[in-house]
């Protein structure tokens, strides 16, 4: 069976939107009005992995682009990147672990924990216009909580 996917946008808990910044980077910034069209639309695929009531494994691709968020070690540091894939083979139910995030719902907010690097989360800075990153903290300055907005196909 084909992998189930849905289209969505994500905003952090400060209401910053995610936009492309160059070919392989996402930034978080406040958008208004027509500028909202700049925000990236994700194709969130529900993939194989450890699952529970409030924890669902997903992959986050960029809609109609052969790019997926992935987690890799760079300079000994778990790092978030946008990785190109062969569109003939993706998305798939059994995604490589670097592409998998545990979508965790807490108090109507979502966290995205790396499956490859437990206790590392998709994060944004309090500062405007900074790259989205894989962060190792929760509950401090950096933001790990998101809301999801569904986008019709």
């Amino acid at each position: 069976a084909p992998v189930r996917s849905l289209n969505c946008t994500l905003r952090d808990s400060q209401q910053k939107s995610l936009v492309m910044s160059g070919p392989y980077e996402l930034k978080a910034l406040h958008l208004q009005g027509q500028d909202m069209e700049q925000q990236v639309v994700f194709s969130m695929s529900f993939v194989q992995g450890e699952e529970s009531n409030d924890k669902i494994p997903v992959a986050l691709g960029l809609k109609e682009k052969n790019l997926y968020l992935s987690c890799v070690l760079k300079d000994d540091k778990p790092t978030l990147q946008l990785e190109s894939v062969d569109p003939k083979n993706y998305p798939k139910k059994k995604m490589e672990k670097r592409f998998v995030f545990n979508k965790i719902e807490i108090n109507n907010k979502l966290e995205f924990e790396s499956a490859q690097f437990p206790n590392w989360y998709i994060s944004t800075s309090q500062a405007e216009n900074m790259p989205v990153f894989l962060g190792g903290t929760k509950g401090g300055q950096d933001i790990t909580d998101f809301t999801m907005q569904f986008v019709s196909s």
Epitope: D76, S125, A127, T137, K138, G140, Q141
Partner: antibody
Framework: QVQLVQSGAEVKKPGASVKVSCKAS????????MHWVRQAPGQGLEWMGL????????VNNQKFKGRVTMTRDTSTSTVYMELSSLRSEDTAVYYC???????????WGQGTLVTVSS | EIVMTQSPATLSVSPGERATFSCRAS??????IHWYQQRPGQAPRLLIK???NDVEGIPARFSGSGSGTEFTLTISSLQSEDFADYYC??????????FGQGTKLEIK
């Protein structure tokens, strides 16, 4: 209020090790990156490494080639920095500081003077 | 490793005048630069974060600007307590975090 309180001054012989502590209070300890920065007499600031209390990840400045070990105790909100194989050039004030991911170090400990002398 | 170069090494300015510090990064760091003041015998103090963002408790006479590789810290009207050492630091690409070598602000 936010506080980082470090252990007291140390005098060590060359070849020995020193362990400096930094006790955090007034904030969510696991919500920040905890750094160690040193300053030799009359010199500038040098980043030594960091530890993330939330997941126990550590990374060091390559310059120290494995001489630095950073640990944490979440039960007491304390981070530790141990520097081994001490030499006279390690005489410095050692600071702990907290930051966000991009390294804005908004609170610092008072500093710990480590003197290495034979 | 990103190298941060501060200039000048020493800056001599009269009280009440404007002081301008420069910091250059060896590669593009966007706005991921922070400025610190260090008075003799004290720990560094964060003055400006993310190139131009204010820090709570820091007087309004301190401001920052720049992006990419060229950055400036300005003190609009020098007070006696401002004579100290000033450091820039990048957080764009780590490890390692790197500091500039510092600028000493002295009374002219």
């Amino acid at each position: 209020q936010v506080q980082l309180v470090q252990s007291g001054a140390e005098v060590k012989k060359p070849g020995a090790s020193v362990k400096v502590s930094c006790k955090a209070s007034g904030f969510s300890f696991t919500g920040y990156y905890m750094h160690w920065v040193r300053q030799a007499p009359g010199q500038g600031l040098e980043w030594m490494g960091l530890i993330i209390p939330h997941n126990d990840y550590t990374v060091n400045n390559q310059k120290f080639k494995g001489r630095v070990t950073m640990t944490r105790d979440t039960s007491t909100s304390t981070v530790y920095m141990e520097l081994s194989s001490l030499r006279s050039e390690d005489t410095a004030v050692y600071y702990c500081a907290r930051s966000d991911y991009y390294g804005a170090m908004d609170y610092w400990g008072q500093g710990t003077l480590v003197t290495v002398s034979s | 490793e990103i190298v941060m170069t501060q200039s000048p090494a020493t800056l001599s300015v009269s009280p009440g005048e404007r002081a301008t510090f420069s910091c250059r990064a060896s590669q593009n760091i966007g706005t991921s630069i922070h400025w610190y003041q260090q008075r003799p015998g004290q720990a560094p103090r964060l003055l400006i974060k993310y190139a131009s963002n204010d820090v709570e408790g820091i007087p309004a006479r301190f401001s920052g600007s720049g992006s990419g590789t060229e950055f400036t810290l300005t003190i609009s009207s020098l007070q006696s307590e401002d004579f100290a050492d000033y450091y820039c630091q990048q957080g764009s690409s780590w490890p390692p975090f790197t500091f500039g070598q510092g600028t000493k602000l002295e009374i002219k």
